[in-house]
């Protein structure tokens, strides 16, 4: 489990507790409700949902 305030993830990705790995913030455009999107500074807005 990740300690609060720490991240093993590189820039542009965020830790997913659901998947137990770093995930791409870019994927928050299509899946904004993913748990890791909260850790992305700003999920890019989607012009439309995939």
């Amino acid at each position: 489990e990740q300690a609060p305030g720490t991240s093993p993830c590189s820039r542009g990705s965020s830790w997913s507790a659901d998947l137990d790995k770093c995930m791409d913030c870019a994927s928050c455009r299509a899946r904004p409700h993913s748990d890791f999107c909260l850790g992305c500074a700003a999920a890019p807005p989607a012009p439309f949902r995939l």
Epitope: D24, S27, R29, A30, R31, P47, L50
Partner: antibody, heavy 119, light 111 residues
Framework: EVKLQQSGGGLVQPGGSMKLSCVAS????????MNWVRQSPEQGLEWIAE??????????HYAESVKGRFTISRDDSKNSVYLQMNNLRPEDTGIYYC??????????WGQGTTLTVSS | DTVLTQSPASLVVSLGQRATISCRAS??????????IHWYQQKPGQPPKFLIK???NRDSGVPARFSGSGSGTDFTLNIHPVEEDDTAIYYC?????????FGAGTKLELQ
């Protein structure tokens, strides 16, 4: 290790039916969108179907070329995805791959299975 | 649908040289933050293998010889220095919308 093990395929006559199966292991299957992509010399790599998550009542998407003829389904309890193909045409001939994506890119692919539609 | 046009269709490169493959989208596939183009390598008798995501981010285990760039409608895959094992067909794919489409592929051969 992620693995997508496919089964099904073979020779079928035009107008016939075939069901493909794909069993996944090594990742959290229920969180991933599952897809079928086919490949032929004529069409190259062609995405044909996707099924998303239980939390959204398993929405599906299809390529226009297969809409109304093909049905994608999944069974999360079996880590499996299926493609039921009806009213098959010669142009459906090709190698069929199952592939998973979280949202954007197809990071894992099955080994492929060949479908030949011919009389 | 967004059409991806790859060029050249085939490419012959000497060992150790640079291979450059282009992928052009029929509409922009980028936001201000990310580009929704991905690259794959396929060898005979094998499924495509995922190489690069979001235009420029290598998958884990992909050698640094592979690099991607571009935004908007124009994208490039570079391989340098080319090695014998790089003989394959390379495809781009977009995830901007449904349907996700692939380019027709670029066949890379060694001289």
């Amino acid at each position: 290790e992620v693995k997508l093990q496919q089964s099904g395929g073979g020779l079928v006559q035009p107008g016939g039916s075939m069901k493909l199966s794909c069993v996944a292991s090594g990742f959290t299957f229920s969180y991933y969108w599952m897809n079928w992509v086919r490949q032929s010399p004529e069409q190259g790599l062609e995405w044909i179907a996707e099924i998303r998550l239980q939390s959204n009542d398993y929405p599906t998407h299809y390529a226009e070329s297969v809409k109304g003829r093909f049905t994608i389904s999944r069974d999360d309890s079996k880590n499996s995805v299926y493609l039921q193909m009806n009213n098959l045409r010669p142009e459906d001939t090709g190698i069929y791959y199952c592939a998973c994506r979280y949202a954007d890119y197809f990071d894992h692919w099955g080994q492929g299975t060949t479908l030949t539609v011919s009389s | 649908d967004t059409v991806l046009t790859q060029s050249p269709a085939s490419l012959v490169v000497s060992l150790g040289q640079r291979a450059t493959i282009s992928c052009r989208a029929s509409q922009s596939v980028s936001t201000s933050d990310y580009s929704y183009i991905h690259w794959y390598q396929q060898k005979p008798g094998q499924p495509p293998k995922f190489l690069i995501k979001y235009a420029s981010n290598r998958d884990s285990g992909v050698p640094a010889r592979f690099s991607g760039s571009g935004s908007g409608t124009d994208f490039t895959l570079n391989i340098h220095p080319v090695e014998e094992d790089d003989t394959a067909i390379y495809y781009c794919q977009h995830s901007w919308e449904i349907p996700p489409t692939f380019g027709a592929g670029t066949k890379l051969e060694l001289q």
